[in-house]
Interface confidence: low
């Protein structure tokens, strides 16, 4: 009720002779601050005096002075909420009731705390979980209802008297609720810990023994077994007998059932501690163990590997890898069941023994086509030699070999012929599936590996083919050697270098670009007339009559080719000049007379000059000289001169006669 002082502290505190006691304590007074505090030992209320009688362990006065003999007991509190006390050292006769007599200005209160001091250090208490199973982590707790700042202690764990190597966690509590020291140890017990003694030892700061508590571990575990075999190495031959015995070395709780396992599978009707195997076969090789169960579960013995020895079985060959590419590496593995493992191997290639090969693996670092075939092996151990199995096939793949391009036509090939070529090869793996040709052309492939060139060109020089499987192999190019008539025949003037003038020395060359075969003949022709059979046509002194259209022909055994007509032009000064008169050389006066200067010239006459009978040049320069009206005095001899870039030429005299008209005669 509200008339009470409120105190909080442990109900009872424990200690032992010579140790100390620390009493955590809080309070709340009814009114005001604390004015007086007395600590009684076993206080008794005296009704007569209305005061408490008993041994006064501590007393504080209003002036705050404490008698010097009170140093063993200390009030560590204050005037309003802390009432903590310390007794150091504590003695056996301090046991009993401590009374805290508190007085404020108007109120008084007696608070009682029990103190239990033993003669010797009392033992801690070990707390265990209700059940401990092997390999399951448990926490062991050691609890001591004591803690005091002035008296350090430690708790140590021992297993069969030996300190435990697991780290323990120690905690202390000095609170108004509880006072204790606790050590917790996390521990995974094994079956071998069953029945062992665990001790929690209380020690002082120097490690001196003070007290302890012990417990015996009850570790539940599956049966622990030992297997024994005769013969001890568990190596036998087919037909021998084998005995295996199972012994239980520990079980908690007691075991209930027994069974035997081979390679993890239970053997039927084998429920005793002895397993007898009579006249063993190689199939009975394997890992054996016995299994015994209890309420915790089944326990298994270590495995015994029973080896039933036998000669190698027929072998098989594994190839890494087939098909193999030429030049790659291949490994062969001989596989044969045998016990003991084969010590020697004999290898065969296509039925022939492979010398010097006695190991389980054969490695060929660089495969060649002739390595292809069937590989088999025979394994051998101390008990005998196995049989040769069916073997494995090595397929060696490689590009087509020895590829050649073959011309099927009769030779020689002529321009315009149809040429057939075939692509041949010696061997190929895998088979050839396609062919390629160089150079590419709009050619026909009538069948695989055959090329038909219609109307073969003169310039089809070489053809090469490739036979292809996964790879292409090219043949060396083959020359078609196409024969053709001479090509690009033309006439070329060699000399003179400039234009041809009459009288010059002239050479014409008959050129052609190519001819196959090389042996050729030449023919020169002018106006259908054969002029010569040399490559050159020569004129020592060319004349205008030599001008004209020339052609040359070149022929070989295949045919002949003509050049385009080539015009030979001869330049010469005007010649064969003559003066012609129209209407005639006799003209009546008053009429019209036309004199024409006719000439032969190349280039044509560019300039004419007219002369009279006195060699007097006339002021006329055209080809025609027109006299109109003609006069009698025009009568006389006329001549003309023609000029071109080459030179000049003159005509002979031509006489014009102008006669009188009848009128004139009549006048006379």
């Amino acid at each position: 009720d509200s008339s009470k002082w409120v105190f909080e502290h442990p109900e009872t505190l424990y200690a032992w002779e010579g140790a100390c006691v620390w009493i955590p304590c809080t309070y709340r007074a009814l009114d005001g601050d604390l004015e007086s505090f007395i600590l009684f030992h076993n206080p008794e209320y005296n009704k007569n005096t209305s005061k408490f009688d008993g041994t006064r362990l501590y007393e504080s006065t209003k002036d705050g002075k404490v008698p010097s003999e009170q140093k063993r007991v200390q009030f560590l509190g204050d005037k309003n909420k802390n009432c903590t006390l310390s007794i150091h050292p504590v003695h056996l006769n301090d046991s009993g009731q401590l009374g805290l007599r508190m007085e404020s200005k108007t109120e008084k209160w007696m608070e009682r705390i029990h103190l239990n001091v033993s003669e010797r250090p009392f033992p801690p208490h070990i707390q265990l979980p209700p059940e401990i199973q092997e390999s399951q982590e448990v926490t062991l707790t050691c609890l001591l209802n004591f803690s005091c700042y002035g008296y350090p202690i430690q708790l140590q764990w021992l297993l069969e008297g030996v300190p435990m190597r697991q780290a323990a966690v120690t905690s202390t509590s000095l609170t108004i609720k509880s006072v204790f020291t606790r050590s917790e140890l996390k521990f995974s017990p094994q079956w071998s810990h069953h029945g062992k003694i665990v001790t929690c030892q209380l020690q002082d700061a120097d490690g001196k023994f003070l007290s302890n508590d012990t417990v015996q571990l009850n570790v539940k575990h599956t049966p622990k077994l030992e297997i024994k075999v005769t013969p001890s190495d568990a190596i036998v031959r087919e037909g021998d007998s084998v005995t295996m015995t199972c012994e239980v070395s520990s079980s908690n709780p007691e075991y209930t059932t027994v069974s035997w396992l081979k390679d993890g599978t239970s053997l039927k009707k084998q429920n005793t501690f002895t397993l007898n195997l009579r006249e063993v076969t190689k199939d009975q090789s394997g890992k054996y163990c016995c299994q015994v169960s209890n309420d915790v579960g089944p326990g298994r013995s270590e495995e015994v590997f029973l080896q039933v020895q036998y000669a190698p079985e027929p072998s098989t060959v594994q190839i890494l890898h087939s098909p193999a590419v030429e030049g790659s590496q291949v490994e062969f593995l001989c596989m044969s069941l045998a016990n003991p493992l084969p010590t020697n191997y004999t290898w065969y290639h296509n039925g022939k023994e492979m010398q010097g090969r006695t190991e389980e693996k054969v490695h060929i670092p660089k495969i060649l086509p002739w390595h292809a075939g069937t590989y088999s092996c025979v394994a051998e151990n101390i008990l005998g030699t196995g049989q040769r199995g069916p073997g494995a096939e090595l397929d060696v793949q490689y590009p087509p070999k020895k590829v050649t391009t073959v011309i099927q036509n009769p030779m020689p090939i002529r321009e315009g012929d149809t040429v057939t070529l075939s692509c041949n090869y010696n061997s190929s793996n895998p088979s050839v599936t396609r062919y390629e040709w160089k150079p590419h052309g709009a050619w026909e492939e009538p069948s695989l590996g055959v090329l038909k060139i219609q109307n073969v060109g003169w310039d089809n020089t070489t053809i090469a083919c490739a036979a292809c499987n996964s790879w292409c192999s090219w043949a060396s190019p083959v020359a078609l050697n196409v024969q053709y008539a001479p090509r690009d025949v033309r006439v070329r003037k060699i000399k003179p270098l400039s234009e041809i003038h009459s009288g010059n020395s002239v050479s014409l060359q008959c050129d052609f670009s190519s001819s196959h075969p090389k042996e050729v003949q030449f023919f020169w022709e002018k106006n259908g007339r054969l002029l010569g059979k040399e490559s050159q046509l020569n004129f020592d002194s060319i004349s205008p009559e030599d001008a004209g259209s020339y052609s040359c022909w070149v022929n070989n055994s295949i045919g002949q080719t003509a050049s385009k007509a080539w015009t030979l032009e001869v330049l010469y000064a005007p010649r064969r000049l003559r003066v012609s008169m129209s209407p005639g050389d006799q003209v009546m006066e008053g009429k019209s007379a036309t004199l024409t200067c006719e000439s032969d010239a190349n280039p044509p006459v560019s300039h004419y000059t007219w002369f009279d009978w006195n060699n007097q040049s006339l002021p006329y320069h055209s080809q025609k000289l027109r006299l109109e009206p003609v006069k009698v005095q025009h009568s006389g001899a006329y001549w003309c001169q023609g000029t071109n870039s080459v030179g000049k030429g003159r005509s002979p005299l031509s006489t014009l006669t102008v006669y009188y008209s009848p009128e004139t005669i009549g006048r006379r």
Epitope: Q329, E331, H349, K352, M354, Q355, G356, R357, E359, K361, H363, I364, P365, K366, L368, P369, W370, H371
Partner: antibody, heavy 124, light 113 residues
Framework: DVKLVESGEGLVKPGGSLKLSCAAS????????MSWVRQTPEKRLEWVAY????????YYADTVKGRFTISRDDARNTLYLQMSSLKSEDTAMYYC?????????????????WGQGTLVTVSA | DIVMIQSPSSLAMSVGQKVTMRCKSS????????????LAWYQQKPGQSPKLLVY???TRESGVPDRFIGSGSGTDFTLTINSVQAEDLADYFC?????????FGAGTKLELK
């Protein structure tokens, strides 16, 4: 017993030619790779040429490549070495050798059997 | 080409002594695929053809006395003759069979004191 007998020894002028033969007996000749090995007057051993059991693969030392030709005639159990463009440095005792087994990676290995040798002298 | 160096070039021993000769290659003769060393040893007695003693560095050819022991790996190899006999007087050659061209050492001449 394996027996290898070389023949064809002779004195040849530089640039000349010579053909060596090796008659084999006591084993299945067609199953074994064969080599020619020579020993110089200074006692140095030099591998010259090699031919596989099928004759499909042939190897030569660089010093004789293009001048010497190794061949075999399995019907006659005979190995040949055709030597042309001979040089003075080809002077040596030429041994016919059988490879360790008919089969070993298609390349020469070690020489299990040797003939008695035939002497080739190249001198002007 | 793989170069083979033999040492010593000659040695003189008494009957019953242990003989050791060495052969060094310019590159490793150990095959990574089968862990074998591709090296052979030959014996050539005066006036005779060479005779195979050891292959794969340590495998003795059948019929070869067990006093001849080949050892070594990679680039360094040894031929040991335990308790040398008078009939062991000969030239000894090592040869690599790792790659073509096959090459021989210049030889070690064993003479008797």
């Amino acid at each position: 017993d394996v027996k290898l007998v070389e023949s064809g020894e002779g004195l040849v002028k530089p640039g000349g030619s010579l053909k060596l033969s090796c008659a084999a007996s006591g084993f299945t000749f067609s199953s074994y790779a064969m080599s020619w090995v020579r020993q110089t007057p200074e006692k140095r051993l030099e591998w010259v040429a090699y031919i596989t059991s099928g004759g499909d693969y042939i190897y030569y030392a660089d010093t004789v490549k293009g001048r010497f030709t190794i061949s075999r005639d399995d019907a006659r159990n005979t190995l040949y070495l055709q030597m042309s463009s001979l040089k003075s440095e080809d002077t040596a005792m030429y041994y016919c050798t059988r490879d360790q087994g008919y089969y070993y990676d298609g390349r020469p290995t070690w020489f299990a059997y040797w003939g008695q040798g035939t002497l080739v002298t190249v001198s002007a | 080409d793989i170069v083979m160096i033999q040492s010593p070039s000659s040695l003189a021993m008494s009957v019953g002594q242990k003989v050791t000769m060495r052969c060094k290659s310019s590159q490793s003769l150990l095959s990574s695929s089968n862990q074998k060393n591709y090296l052979a040893w030959y014996q050539q007695k005066p006036g005779q053809s060479p005779k195979l003693l050891v292959y794969f560095a340590s495998t003795r050819e059948s019929g070869v006395p067990d006093r001849f022991i080949g050892s070594g790996s990679g680039t360094d190899f040894t031929l040991t003759i335990n308790s040398v006999q008078a009939e062991d007087l000969a030239d000894y050659f090592c040869q690599q069979h790792y790659s073509t061209p096959l090459t021989f050492g210049a030889g070690t001449k064993l003479e008797l004191k």
